[in-house]
């Protein structure tokens, strides 16, 4: 039995997968920040987790997915105020009793040191210094991501 938040996450991810392929993104849109091969948008306003998920989807992006500790640290370095929390694309799957990214993969326990409980209706937020489990209904800011398309170097034949 999936929770309403899991259903919302799956529905949005599926609708994103159904959309037609768009041309690759070479530069970050206005107001987005580049972090390596991603464009990040740090919201100014606040929302519960599922509204944040939906908002990123309407922007043809997704809630932030963090690959490893290194990416976490680089993302946290972009957060200017240490008191602010941001939703990312990770929530607790009640059916699988594990933290699950919105792309369907599970959290590698070594990647993030989560403060708080792993339980139903828990979603993950990050601050400048930490990673927290919060009630998904909490209204905080969020981070959307778009993947940049890597530009392959052109190889010119010898002249």
């Amino acid at each position: 039995q999936k929770s309403s938040i899991e259903k919302c996450s799956v529905d949005i991810q599926q609708s994103r997968n159904k959309t037609t392929e768009r041309p690759g993104l070479l530069n970050c849109p206005i107001y987005w920040q580049q972090l390596r091969e991603k464009c990040l948008l740090f919201s100014h306003t606040v929302n519960p987790w599922n509204n944040s998920l939906a908002d990123c989807s309407t922007k043809e992006s997704s809630l932030l997915l963090i690959r490893d500790k290194d990416e976490l640290i680089h993302t946290q370095n972009l957060i200017r105020d240490k008191a602010i929390l941001f939703w990312i694309g990770l929530n607790f799957s009640l059916s699988e009793k594990n933290w699950k990214w919105i792309n369907g993969s599970f959290l590698n326990s070594n990647d993030l040191e989560i403060r708080g409980d792993a339980k139903e209706n828990s979603c993950i937020s990050i601050s400048q210094t930490s990673v927290y489990s919060e009630y998904c209904s909490t209204e905080i800011r969020w981070i959307c991501q778009k993947e940049l398309t890597p530009v392959r170097n052109k190889v010119y034949p010898d002249s």
Epitope: I30, Y31, S43, H44, T45, V46, A54, T58, E60, R80
Partner: antibody, heavy 117, light 110 residues
């Protein structure tokens, strides 16, 4: 270039509902929030509220009980409804692009709405 | 009554600098780095000039600059020109997805 065009009746009777539409051209309506702002003659600006294409809305607390906003993504239109209007609601109404919910980077030219019987 | 307080008027001669203040509280200007400024010529829509306290959108001359100290934000126009004569409005995020404006300042170029 992003362009916003407000439309609707220029005259509304007291106690009736003011209805305005803003048509967006030159950019995707989906990637941004959209706000309505008004300005009574000779006075300052007042933020009315914003709508997200995901369906969420945020309203100025002082107007919240009378305001409804929505988005029609297929028509690239944002609508404003303000109920139970009085003469105090007479103003130029602007729609504006609200990229992050904290500032307004593109504005329509505005539409004057007069509340009078 | 506007949530943010601006002086009703300001003036300066061509080439001079003028600073317009915008005073709020710790719940708006002082609490967030989300102050923006708009220029409005008579009969026209407001024009976006500054966001996030001091960032300038493309196309806005670098004569316009923004700053903030405590609960007060400021817009400085240096090298004043005749076309700068207009009304200027500040705005700030005020928490819980709310936005407030100042009452406006009429800038006169003498």
């Amino acid at each position: 270039q992003v362009q916003l065009q407000e439309s609707g009746p220029g005259l509304v009777k007291p106690s009736e509902t003011l209805s305005l539409t803003c048509t967006v051209s030159g950019d995707s309506i989906n990637s941004y929030y959209w706000s309505w702002i008004r300005q009574p003659a000779g006075k300052g600006l007042e933020w009315i509220g914003r709508t997200y294409t995901s369906g969420s809305t945020n309203y100025n607390p002082s107007l919240k009980s009378r305001v409804t906003m929505s988005v029609d993504t297929s028509k690239k239109q944002i609508s404003l409804k303000l109920s139970s209007v009085t003469a105090a609601d007479t103003a130029v109404y602007y729609c504006a692009r609200d990229p992050l919910g904290t500032f307004f980077d593109y504005w329509g030219q505005g539409i004057l709405v007069t509340v009078s019987s | 009554q506007s949530a943010l307080t601006q002086p009703p008027s300001a003036s300066g001669s061509p080439g001079q600098s003028v600073t317009i203040s915008c005073t709020g509280t710790s719940s708006d200007v002082g609490g967030y780095n989300y102050v923006s400024w708009y220029q409005q010529h008579p009969g026209k829509a407001p024009k976006f000039m500054i966001y996030e306290v001091s960032k300038r959108p493309s196309g806005v001359p670098d004569r316009f600059s923004g700053s903030k100290s405590g609960n007060t934000a400021s817009l400085t126009v240096s090298g004043l020109q005749a076309e700068d004569e207009a009304d200027y409005y500040c705005s700030s995020y005020a928490g819980i997805n709310n936005v407030v404006f100042g009452g406006g300042t009429k800038l006169t170029v003498l």
